[in-house]
């Protein structure tokens, strides 16, 4: 059974994942982002079901394509580069989903834009956090 400290750690990790996904989304939605139109042409796979931590496998499998799209936001001044954000998200996802069980991700038939994709995983984090608090 999960202990109070392990639940607290899971919650903190989910909060960090949520914050970085929101940060990426905010950067994409920024009115000063000239690459937004191009970014929206890329399609992402959405999970058929995302209700448990093991479903983060579906997010993990889309992190490389996500980084490639974020690289379009070429800036003279990156405070954080796309690879910094994706690397941190990857570490959190691996810790949250665990490596004991191998879960085969099932994807929905419809693909999504980067904005829809990020919003889906933001909602996922918020939903899981709400069950822990």
């Amino acid at each position: 059974a999960p202990t109070s400290s392990s639940t607290k750690k899971t919650q903190l990790q989910l909060e960090h994942l949520l914050l970085d996904l929101q940060m990426i989304l905010n950067g994409i939605n920024n009115y000063k982002n000239p690459k937004l139109t191009r970014m929206l042409t890329f399609k992402f796979y959405m999970p058929k079901k995302a209700t448990e931590l093991k479903h983060l496998q579906c997010l993990e499998e889309e992190l490389k394509p996500l980084e490639e799209v974020l690289n379009l936001a070429q800036s003279k001044n990156f405070h954080l580069r796309p690879r910094d954000l994706i690397s941190n998200i990857n570490v959190i996802v691996l810790e949250l989903k665990g490596s004991e069980t191998t879960f085969m991700c099932e994807y929905a038939d419809e693909t999504a834009t980067i904005v829809e994709f990020l919003n889906r995983w933001i909602t996922f984090c918020q939903s899981i956090i709400s069950t822990l608090t």
């Epitope: 970085d20 940060m23 800036s75 910094d84 954000l85 941190n88």
Partner: nanobody
Framework: EVQLVESGGGLVQPGGSLRLSCAAS????????MGWYRQAPGKQRELVAA???????NYADSVKGRFTISRDNAKNTVYLQMNSLKPEDTAVYYC?????????????WGQGTQVTVSS
Amino acid sequence: EVQLVESGGGLVQPGGSLRLSCAASGSIFSINVMGWYRQAPGKQRELVAAISSGGSTNYADSVKGRFTISRDNAKNTVYLQMNSLKPEDTAVYYCAYASSWYEDETDYWGQGTQVTVSS
């Protein structure tokens, strides 16, 4: 409006350590990047390290393995632990607050704190 107050600078011998702190107050958003930039005399301001509210980090190559950036979201404070300091680390260190990860402009800058590495 965001106010940034830095502390922890000073004079240190080569090989020594310092810990810089920067507390942000005012209109803080929960989603942000805070970091440290530095400017040596006659040189351009350069990134030292940055960290997102979610914990993503970026370090300048010249400080990797020596400096560690961390933050306390509850206190809106960012820290820079500087170890194995070298004379070339001498500069004014500025705290930065940004609402985006890729912006070409930084939203707010601190006043700066002097770090001098000399024997």
